[in-house]
Amino acid sequence: AIVFIKQPSSQDALQGRRALLRCEVEAPGPVHVYWLLDGAPVQDTERRFAQGSSLSFAAVDRLQDSGTFQCVARDDVTGEEARSANASFNIKWIEAGPVVLKHPASEAEIQPQTQVTLRCHIDGHPRPTYQWFRDGTPLSDGQSNHTVSSKERNLTLRPAGPEHSGLYSCCAHSAFGQACSSQNFTLSIADESFARVVLAPQDVVVARYEEAMFHCQFSAQPPPSLQWLFEDETPITNRSRPPHLRRATVFANGSLLLTQVRPRNAGIYRCIGQGQRGPPIILEATLHLAEIEDMPLFEPRVFTAGSEERVTCLPPKGLPEPSVWWEHAGVRLPTHGRVYQKGHELVLANIAESDAGVYTCHAANLAGQRRQDVNITVATVPSWLKKPQDSQLEEGKPGYLDCLTQATPKPTVVWYRNQMLISEDSRFEVFKNGTLRINSVEVYDGTWYRCMSSTPAGSIEAQARVQVLEKLKFTPPPQPQQCMEFDKEATVPCSATGREKPTIKWERADGSSLPEWVTDNAGTLHFARVTRDDAGNYTCIASNGPQGQIRAHVQLTVAVFITFKVEPERTTVYQGHTALLQCEAQGDPKPLIQWKGKDRILDPTKLGPRMHIFQNGSLVIHDVAPEDSGRYTCIAGNSCNIKHTEAPLYVVDKPVPEESEGPGSPPPYKMIQT
């Protein structure tokens, strides 16, 4: 059976605040839990949703959450449905409303000495307590001539007289919170001796050095007094004007005229009317100086034909709010049609090529006018002036492929080689007109090239095949100086390529023929056994029909390759003693010997007093130190080859003889003793 571990319970809740109706069930099998409100299923919303099996309220709503909630658990296997206890919210709320006239039926019926009843339309639960205000001052119950009924939310004035005139507002508070009237009621009961507003001054915005006029009139019996004050409470009269209001004139009808208005004249002007009886009436109006800022720049715009686009003109900050309009070719745009103005936007519907040009956004107010141009380009699909052609380009020379197109705006041209985008580098350059230059054509440049010309309106493309006309060349060029080992077999290769397969032959530079033990086999010079006489200058000649011939000169040297007669050995030396590393090499030409110690070449001219390299190639190091330890390499080289051999040098401390050892004890390892 389904058992409720936690059941929802009725509770207080605050309007707009969080709440949770708990429900937890236990059953032998899986159960589905859902909620009912007044018997109807509760659908999840962002405001009210199931949280596990409980029902969560992000913000309680007094209208949507009033009623009885019930948690229902359903076991689909057994079919059992169990319902929790009912739960409801006692929702506390308060809601503002206006102050309205309850009695008499209309304002027109209000006369001195009649009863006037006002009602405060603030409602709430629990019922709030009310406080009434006249012109912002609290009215306490039991004051003369008025009574407050909290139950009916009414304020009754009996009888109502001119002294009750004013702005009536109310506030209410309860356990939930506080609210004040959303709309207040102005009670006006005439007393001839009270000043009454006939004409109130209005806020004025004027341009600098223009004139400003404030109108102000009161009526009363006897006539009331009228006085103008500027911000700092300085009175303004025709006899005593403050220094910064020298150009102010007060007319007999109460109007105030300011001429040649400057920034220091901006501010609040107060017109005060005082009747024989009653309070003074203070009316305020502000004088603002008109201003207009600069407009932000437009980025040029590129649109495509047939589309609909909008350009928004942000009006500059200004006072009064600047009016905005768009012009094209000196003509103001209409508010409907195909190209028109909508609000601050320029709208171009079904754009045509003829719509391209300069459009101007104008903004103006009393302070002046500002304008900003936007350049509109209508993009067209590129068209061909010259397509790339299948071309034969000569190897090693610059090659050109044209891709000449025209469109608005200027089209962007990109090139592809074998479907791969060509990025400009030292070999490829794309000119402004779209032509591709291959700086030094190579054999493998012979492939497909495709150019694509694009604008926002679309793109066109064409491809061409490049055939490279190979130059006659050695591949690779033979080394100009080569060595052959005496009494050994040797080969000197020579190969070339061209538009046609070239014929290759060798000859001696002096024109003499090759000896019988030297053969020329398809460009490879073969010496069966090198003799001293084989040294000399040779020429490899490559030729074909269309391209003629080319020559490569090679000087062959016959040499006895280097061998070491004496090689340095692993050496251990006491610190402070002298180390000798021997090295002797032979060969023809006679090899030179260099030493490398600790990974750097030992320069004989910079060795210092401790090191010396002998004529025979041996290296001597005097007064050795631990830092001299390491591998030493003897390098023997001549113009034909190079060979090296290495050995380690160990520098050790001299041992202190122990008493047990006799004077003739041998050292613990093989040493050089000097």
């Epitope: 299923p41 296997v77 057994t78 079919g79 449905e81």
Partner: antibody, heavy 113, light 107 residues
């Protein structure tokens, strides 16, 4: 002991109507969801309709929606299935089930001209 | 709608064999799955609910496992009275759907 007995089956022409009943005993009928399930001859089981304990929630298979109506009378411990606009493919044994743990023996509905 | 696919559709086995039937759901149904046994001319009988809980009175040789989309019914040692058709059904969402059934026959 839970008992479910279906009745009301029989032969009916295409386009005709039938009302099936299911008499329940041996459990608190008003606290349980009830279901109708059918099985065409030689075929598998097909769920038809469900009704919650107080008829708040009612569900139908797409194949019968708009033609069949499930209802219950908790005072009489009875479940009903009103079948209108019957088709040949509605021919089946109709079972009434308490949830899905206890089933009646079924009643055969044959729709044929 | 959630589709349930049973495999195999037919199964031949001998008494004492261990038999496994699989039910695959087209979307996650948590553990809201039941298994039935039906013999010819009879109403289906509930064997397993909540994917793995044995219904009261059902022999312990029947067991269920799985959750999400993969479920199995296992009969550890087949008895003569177990030759029948077995159905799975999901109780996760409406419409309630059944597998097409697995018929267990004597080899």
């Amino acid at each position: 002991e839970v008992q479910l007995v279906e009745s009301g089956g029989g032969l009916v022409k295409p386009g005709g109507s039938l009302r099936l009943s299911c008499a329940a005993s041996g459990f608190t009928f008003s606290s349980y969801i009830m279901n109708w399930v059918r099985q065409a001859p030689g075929k598998g089981l097909e769920w038809v309709s469900s009704i919650s304990s107080s008829s708040t929630f009612i569900y139908y298979a797409d194949s019968v929606k708009g033609r069949f109506t499930i209802s219950r009378d908790n005072a009489k411990n009875s479940l009903y299935l009103q079948m209108n606009s019957l088709r040949a493919e509605d021919t089946a044994v109709y079972y009434c089930a308490k949830g899905f743990d206890y089933w009646g023996q079924g009643t055969l509905v044959t729709v044929s001209s | 709608d959630i589709q349930l696919t049973q495999s195999p559709s037919f199964l031949s086995a001998s008494v004492g064999d261990r038999v496994t039937i699989t039910c695959r759901a087209s979307q996650d149904i948590s553990s809201y799955l039941v298994w039935y046994q039906q013999k010819p001319g009879k109403a289906p009988k509930l064997l397993i609910y909540a994917a793995s809980t044995l219904q009261s009175g059902v022999p312990s040789r029947f067991s269920g496992s799985g959750s999400g989309t993969e479920f199995t019914l296992t009969i550890s040692s087949l008895q003569p009275e177990d030759f029948a058709t077995y159905y799975c059904q999901q109780l996760n969402t409406y419409p309630r759907t059944f597998g097409q059934g697995t018929k267990v026959e004597i080899k």
